[in-house]
């Protein structure tokens, strides 16, 4: 899978997305990597 | 609202070193990475690299990887890219850019600083 | 690194026009394309993620397709305001790279 910072982010945006946005606060795109997912 | 922004233009002679500023503001400027562009005139767009706010780590395009320095202070949410040992192909207007969650989900671009390498 | 080629390079067309840009990598990307319109001296202001998502604000009227190494951008219905020069970029793998254009002028 894609672990460049912007591939993290939009990744990061969609599982945010379908959360609803709960998640921790400090589950940011510079605080993960992409192992995260 | 979202906004970064960038440094005045610059005219430096060549050889010498420059270091722009980009100032975030309207987000959490530590949760996002910051990456800057260059356009040189009448030309295409070119990735130098990003910085991670959060931690000082960083990812170089090759091409400038020894000349071009990210950084950043977060007490101020201000982003820094210095450029040495400049050329006359360093001419070009210098874009800050960052992809933010929240407040908004959007890459949103500085107003771009226009260096001009000259004696 | 990727390389990336756009075509046309140039498209003369008018209002109400339907247009189709293509991209295409120099190796597969998987969806990871990101499209911008920029307007002379100004800032690339973002269009589409992931290949076909538009961000918040973007038009309808702007829509993207593709994956690996071809993708294309397509308007609808051009609007005066898109008279622009439009470049893609990959993000799939580092350093990030970008098309060299496709500027479209008014017919």
């Known amino acids: 899978a894609c672990d460049t910072a912007t591939c993290v982010t939009h990744r990061l945006a969609g599982l945010l997305s379908r959360s609803g946005g709960v998640v921790k606060n400090n589950f940011v795109p510079t605080n993960v990597g992409s192992k995260a997912f | 609202q979202v906004q970064l922004v960038q440094s005045g233009a610059e005219v430096v002679k060549p050889g010498a070193s420059v270091k722009i500023s980009c100032k975030a503001s309207?987000?959490?400027?530590?949760?996002?990475?910051m990456n800057w562009v260059k356009q040189a005139p009448g030309q295409g767009l070119e990735w130098i690299g990003d910085?991670?706010?959060?931690?000082?780590?960083?990812h170089y395009n090759q091409k400038f990887k020894g000349r071009a320095t990210l950084t950043v202070d977060t007490s101020i949410s201000t982003a820094y890219m210095e450029l040495s040992r400049l050329r006359s192909d360093d001419t070009a207007v210098y874009y800050c850019?960052?992809?933010?969650?929240?407040?908004?989900?959007?890459?949103?671009w500085g107003q771009g600083t226009l260096l001009t390498v000259s004696s | 690194d990727i390389q990336l080629t756009q075509s046309p390079s140039f498209l003369s067309t008018s209002v109400g026009d339907r247009v189709t840009i293509t991209c295409k990598a120099s190796q597969n990307v998987g969806p990871n394309v990101a499209w911008y319109r920029q307007k002379p001296g100004k800032s690339p202001k973002a269009l589409i993620y992931?290949?076909?998502y538009r961000y918040s604000g973007v038009p309808s009227r702007f829509s993207g397709s593709g994956s690996g190494t071809e993708f294309t951008l397509t308007i609808s219905s051009l609007q005066p305001e898109d008279f622009a020069t439009y470049i893609c970029?990959?993000?799939?793998?580092?350093?990030?790279?970008f098309g060299q254009g496709t500027k479209l002028e008014i017919k």
């Open positions: 309207g987000y959490t400027f530590t949760d996002y990475y």
């Open positions: 850019a960052s992809i933010t969650i929240v407040p908004v989900y959007f890459d949103f």
């Open positions: 910085v991670n706010p959060n931690n000082g780590g960083t």
């Open positions: 992931s290949a076909s």
């Open positions: 970029q990959q993000y799939n793998y580092y350093p990030y790279t």
